[in-house]
């Protein structure tokens, strides 16, 4: 019973997890404009992996894709390479273990296949869930070298006279989204994994023996026994996981059509 | 077509408050902000603030801080100005914009003359 | 707050004529972002509240005459007219739209000879 639910409970924390790294790729807030200490601007910038925004006092917000893959800047690109490893291995594992889940029947699949395949999905989360961290880690450790970059010549001038104000970027409510939706894919895949040591049928065989009895000539020979995992054929009050998790989309909503910046 | 009526002029003396409204037709109100606009007489343009139609957010310049406020009556498509405790200083012509792209203020009321007199 | 300094004050110019004032702000109104310079252009007649010319620096209004050209970048920024009409005597006015307050230039008065 505990193996089942912590199967179905790794699973659902799993989707949850993998549906929080779909919605923060997909995010366009990786990073934000820095309000902090700037003049005040009617106008915010905000960029994704994909696409860089500008939203302005008025209402009018304007987003633009990086349609080059050349000039794109190699920690980006591998950023998103590792998102998309970590969404593929995510997926992957998903369908795996949902063929592995003790509360499934498909045909007459023996638990040691279970037990594997609960384990194969199990390491997918946890790569994708380091996939995502990773990325997300990544960008962030991008961010902060170039707020402090942009911080050290915050302010260029021509004499001193004109001023030219340098946007800094801070951390993005994706990078949220990424390092908590990675951890809860990892924290699932450790639970699979777990999952799968109570799954795996352990063969405790012993010996036959032969008791030899006065009179009579009747061996009782013990057949090799299972280890009691506590799930037997008995399939009478079976606890059923549907793991119907409700995925949130994670992505933001502003608070008005123009917001005030 | 898109019009801003804005309301009469005014006359006033000084201390007392005076509140000029702004009614918007031809444009969804809450999807634009709505921005005001001071001039005195044979003056430039001075920026008072905007207010945000959907969340009725305001902000006002640092010149117009305390005496000058904002609202929305987004039933009646309507934004106002009220200005209190009145100085001749505020004798002018008040316009009400709509700020649109490029934080551009595209459309403009015809003005409401507030004179200060006592 | 940002300054806004137009120039110059006043034009005196015949029909026909091309014209050039200038607007200069204290800060860099181009946004890194979408490499927008957020000034914005409006002519304002005797009477009347003003209108607006372009924004976005040099993108046009609908319905203005393409007569009417905004450039520059940064700091420095320039409306022009190729041809002057009579009904283009009025005062030109250049606004920050990219830090609060959305200050105003002082103007540019145009007038015919």
């Known amino acids: 019973m505990a193996v089942t639910a912590c199967q179905g409970l790794g699973f659902v924390v799993s989707l949850i997890g993998i549906a929080g790294i779909i919605a923060a790729t997909c995010m366009d807030q990786w990073s934000t404009q820095d309000l902090y200490n700037n003049p005040v601007t009617a106008v915010f910038n905000y960029q994704g992996l994909w696409r860089s925004c500008v939203r302005e006092s008025s209402g009018f917000t304007e987003c633009r894709g990086y349609f080059t893959l050349l000039g794109l800047p190699a920690m980006l690109q591998a950023v998103r390479a590792l998102m998309i490893v970590g969404i593929v291995l995510g997926a992957i594992g998903l369908l795996v273990s949902i063929f592995a889940l003790k509360c499934i029947r498909i045909g007459s699949m023996e638990d040691s296949a279970k037990a594997n395949m609960t384990l194969t999905s199990g390491i997918m989360f946890i790569v994708s869930g380091l996939c995502a961290i990773a990325g997300v880690s990544v960008f962030a450790n991008m961010l902060v070298t170039n707020f402090w970059m942009s911080t050290a010549n915050m302010y260029t001038g021509m004499g001193g006279m004109v001023q030219t104000v340098q946007t800094r970027y801070t951390f993005g409510a994706a990078l949220f989204v990424g390092w908590v939706a990675g951890g809860l894919t990892l924290i699932g895949g450790v639970m699979m994994c777990i999952a799968c040591r109570g799954l795996a049928p352990e063969e405790t065989n012993y010996k036959a023996v032969s008791y030899h009895a006065s009179g009579h000539s009747v061996a009782y020979k013990p057949g090799g026994f299972k280890a009691s995992t506590g799930f037997g054929s008995n399939t009478k009050n079976k606890k059923i996981y549907d793991g119907g998790a409700r995925t949130e989309d994670e992505v933001q909503s502003y608070p008005s059509k123009h917001d005030y910046v | 077509q898109i019009q801003l009526v804005q309301s009469g002029p005014e006359l006033r003396k000084p201390g007392e408050t005076v509140k000029i409204s702004c009614k918007a037709s031809?444009?969804?109100?809450?999807?634009?902000?709505m921005s005001w606009v001071k001039q005195a007489p044979g003056k430039g343009l001075k920026w008072m603030g905007w207010i945000n139609t959907y969340s009725g957010v305001p902000t006002y310049a640092d010149d117009f801080k305390g005496r000058v406020a904002f609202s929305l009556e987004t039933s009646a498509s309507t934004a106002y100005l009220q200005i209190k405790n009145l100085k001749n200083e505020d004798t002018a012509t008040y316009f009400c914009?709509?700020?649109?792209?490029?934080?551009?203020?595209?459309?403009w009321g015809q003005g409401t003359s507030v004179t200060v007199s006592s | 707050d940002i300054v806004m300094t137009q120039s110059p004050s006043s034009l005196t110019v015949t029909a026909g004529e091309k014209v050039t004032m200038s607007c200069k702000s204290s800060?860099?109104?181009?946004?890194?972002?979408?490499?927008?310079?957020?000034l914005t252009w409006y002519q304002q007649k005797p009477g009347q509240p003003p209108k607006l010319l372009i924004y976005w620096a040099s993108t046009r209004e609908s319905g203005v005459p393409d007569r009417f050209t905004g450039s520059g970048s940064g700091t420095d920024f320039t409306l022009t007219i190729s041809s002057v009409q009579a009904e283009d005597l009025a005062i030109y006015y250049c606004?920050?739209?990219?830090?609060?307050?959305?200050?105003f230039g002082a103007g540019t008065r145009l007038e015919l000879k």
């Open positions: 914009a709509r700020f649109r792209r490029g934080n551009a203020l595209d459309n």
């Open positions: 606004q920050n739209n990219y830090f609060y307050p959305l200050t």
């Open positions: 031809g444009f969804p109100f809450t999807t634009d902000g």
């Open positions: 800060q860099s109104l181009l946004n890194s972002g979408n490499q927008k310079n957020y």
